[in-house]
Interface confidence: medium
């Protein structure tokens, strides 16, 4: 932002109404009327460049110096061409020299030379020429110079002429201050710019109305350079929620429209599924039946639960079970759904039912599932089965109603043994079998049938209660064919898969695990 | 030494016209801003016109404006002054007046200009 | 235009007199003002511009004062050569005006 000036002298806008102090009295220095763009101007000038050495002093008027550290000073004027007088003026001179002195008090008319302080000699940039001088072509230079620190109440400042034809036009002595500022959504109020070039004032700023530091940012800070320039800004504010920024300040959000927390970003719409908000809202309630989960921003549409898995299928393999279901229908306006599956069984003579699940194996854990199937193994055979599939989303746990879709189920086989050769030799093989532990009380013998591969004549078939045999009296180096069958009260189980074990031939005898 | 020295006047009727010359010499014609001025017969001096150094800008008094036109010559260090639709109250000693700045000792011009240096003048009359 | 106003239209005096003419504007003109000096058949001659600087080779016994609306012209210790009618004219607008002159003769 452009630094601000605050005048403390200005000779033009005076009006020739000032009344400076000329040195010696009489001579030298004068003030005089011009006409300029048809308004007349005042100016002090001197033109004594033929009359030798020169010392011709203008002291201003003693300036209140205020609040001011560092004072800047403008000049405005002409200097003519040493050139364009008779000869030259071989004691002409094209510059001046200009001086201050601080004072606590005003001396008025007690004037002295020692007291004053030079600040530079002041040349111009462009000298009048004959030409222009006839053509009433004012070459005006602009010069600045600056003092600082001022420490008392007051100073004056003067002008030596050394024999120049020179007029002053111009004289302004200001002070720059930062202005007063909004930026970053903070305040800064106006602030006197320092008196050394190399420092920063450091100003911190308050936060507009309605607006606030952002968690773990910094607060607003800017810095009043010497210049009057706010540089470097630090941190920032925010518009709070339920405001939004709006040139520079903070306005509630409009009826319809929220804003939840402090940021950047505008008030939004409320979106589907809300109720209309109120202005300044931070967030939208849900219409009645739909909800919104904890870890839902406030931008999200409310929700509610899914509709139950649209269509749900139990195919019995044995003793496994298969379950697959489709999405619900009504997925709630929600993508986080998961599925549960629960599990009861019955027994077909007692009717009497219970829960399932410690006896029963999942293929993947069964609640939290997000695919569509699963599979259910270690069935009882001759046991009924009801499977329950839930489906859930993240607003379910807000209401007390559930979105679920059953499937029973009749397992008549015990499943299939896992058939394993413990060890073989030239006429024997020993064969071991396994079925889930909730099966085996129900089977009462296992039945292993084997015959020679190739031979569709004949076969044999060895009864046993326990979970292993060993088949003998057959032929070295022979493959042949082995399953194993399970035998409950009701019949017959399922049959293990067709294992083909080879015996030993006669040179590679002994009897070897495989 | 500064030498100006007019001529050109004479005897003319109501409605005629006249050239009037000034002829400059001993200093540097091209520095200088030069104007007519007139005095009528035991009347006061009257500023007739103007020219800038090197032929701009021209100004007219109010009396002459549309009638006479000041122009100059640098090469020949020659002004003029041509007077058309001559009227009787034009009837004047004619002075050409010349103005250089640089025994001007002072920081900014005058917004106008006074006359440093005189011809001797060339009486116009204008009757029928 | 300016009007330029001068006292007395004529005056009489003595070699050795001092003598001041006055010359008024009709408006402030700062200090632009000159003074020329007249002899019969002859042409003016500049005194003094800028109201009180004197033109080069002109006596010191002639001296210009005053600002604004205001201005003289003093002649200290009138000399012989020194009676004659004497103007003033403003250079403060393009539309330069004479006084109406003050003739000086001799008492």
């Known amino acids: 932002a452009q630094g601000k000036e605050v005048v403390l002298l200005d000779f033009a806008a005076a009006g020739g109404e000032l009344g400076w102090l000329t040195h010696p009295y009489g001579k030298g220095w004068d003030l005089m009327q011009n006409i300029m763009n048809d308004m007349p101007i005042y100016m002090y000038s001197v033109c004594n460049v033929m009359s030798g050495d020169q010392d011709n002093w203008l002291r201003t008027n003693w300036v209140y110096r205020g609040e001011a550290e560092r004072i800047f000073i403008e000049l405005k004027f002409t200097v003519r061409d040493c050139n364009s007088f008779p000869g030259g003026a071989s004691s002409c001179k094209e510059t001046f020299n200009l001086y201050y002195a601080e004072s606590d008090l005003d001396y008025g008319t007690n004037f002295q030379k020692r007291l004053f302080t030079k600040i530079d000699t002041i040349a111009p940039d462009e000298i009048t020429v004959s030409s222009d001088f006839e053509a009433r072509h004012v070459k005006l230079n602009v010069e600045e110079r600056s003092v600082g620190p001022l420490t008392r109440k007051g100073f004056y400042l003067a002008f030596q002429d050394i024999g120049a034809c020179v007029a002053l036009l111009s004289v302004r002595v200001y002070y720059k201050k930062c202005p007063e500022l909004l930026q970053g959504l903070a305040h800064f109020p106006e602030t006197i710019a320092g008196s050394d070039a190399p420092s920063l004032a450091t100003v911190a700023g308050t936060c507009v109305d309605h607006a606030v530091v952002p968690p773990g940012g910094e607060e607003p800070r800017m810095h009043c350079a010497v210049d009057g320039e706010w540089l470097v800004p630090i941190g920032q504010c925010l518009c709070q929620a339920g405001y939004e920024k709006v040139e520079d300040a903070c306005q509630a959000c409009s009826p319809g429209f929220f804003k939840f927390e402090a940021s950047e970003s505008p008030c939004l719409e409320c979106p589907e599924h809300t109720l209309p908000s109120p202005e300044g809202a931070t967030s939208c309630e849900c219409e009645e039946g739909f909800f919104r989960a904890p870890q839902d921003p406030a931008s999200m549409p409310c929700t509610r639960p899914p509709s139950a898995p649209h269509y749900l299928t139990a195919v019995g393999m044995g003793a496994k079970v298969e379950l697959r279901w489709t999405p619900p229908q009504d997925s709630g306006g929600r993508e986080d759904i998961v599925y549960s599956v629960t599990c009861e069984q019955c027994w077909p003579e007692s009717g009497e039912c219970g829960p399932c699940e410690a006896s029963v194996r999942y293929s993947e854990p069964p609640h939290g599932l997000t695919r569509t199937s699963v599979t259910v193994s270690d069935l009882e055979p001759h046991m009924n089965y009801t499977f329950t599939v839930e489906a859930r989303n993240g607003v379910s746990g807000l209401v007390t109603s559930r979105s679920f879709r059953t499937a029973s189920v009749s397992i008549n086989q015990t499943e299939p043994p896992k058939v394993r050769l413990e060890g073989r030799s030239t006429t024997s093989l020993s064969v071991s079998w396994s079925i889930p532990p909730p099966q085996q009380s129900r089977v009462w013998k296992y039945e292993v049938t084997y015959r020679k591969k190739g031979d569709s004549n004949s076969y044999n078939v060895r009864r046993t209660e326990g979970f292993s045999v060993t088949l003998d009296d057959l032929a070295p180096d022979t493959t042949y064919l082995v399953q194993v069958q399970a035998l409950t009260q009701e019949g017959q189980g399922a049959g293990s898969k067709v294992h083909e074990f080879q015996t030993l031939s006669p040179e590679g005898s002994g009897n070897l695990a495989v | 030494e500064v030498q100006l020295l007019e001529s050109g006047g004479g005897l003319v009727q109501p409605g005629g016209s006249l050239r009037l010359s000034c002829a400059a010499s001993?200093?540097?014609?091209?520095?200088?801003?030069m104007a007519w001025v007139r005095q009528a017969p035991g009347k006061g001096l009257e500023w007739v016109s103007r020219i800038g150094p090197s032929g701009g800008p021209t100004h007219y008094a109010d009396s002459v404006k549309g009638r006479f036109t000041i122009s100059r010559d640098n090469s020949k260090n020659t002004l003029y002054l041509q007077m058309n639709s001559l009227r009787a109250e034009d009837t004047a000693v004619y002075y050409c007046?010349?103005?250089?700045?640089?025994?001007?000792?002072?920081?900014?011009?005058?917004?106008?200009?006074?006359?440093?240096?005189w011809g001797q003048g060339t009486l116009v009359t204008v009757s029928s | 235009d300016i009007q330029m106003t001068q006292s007395p239209s004529s005056l009489s005096a003595s070699v050795g007199d001092r003598v001041t003419i006055t010359c008024r504007a009709s408006q402030s003109i700062s200090t632009w003002l000159a003074w020329y000096q007249q002899k019969p058949g002859k042409a003016p001659k500049l005194l003094i511009y800028k109201a009180s600087n004197l033109h080069t080779g002109v006596p010191s016994r002639f001296s210009g004062s005053g600002s604004g609306t205001e201005f003289s012209l003093t002649i200290s210790g009138l000399q012989p050569d020194d009676f004659a009618t004497y103007y003033c004219q403003q250079y403060n607008q393009y539309s330069r005006t004479f006084g109406q002159g003050t003739k000086v003769e001799i008492k």
């Open positions: 001993g200093f540097t014609f091209s520095h200088y801003m």
């Open positions: 007046a010349g103005y250089d700045s640089g025994y001007d000792y002072v920081a900014v011009a005058g917004p106008a200009e006074y006359f440093q240096h």
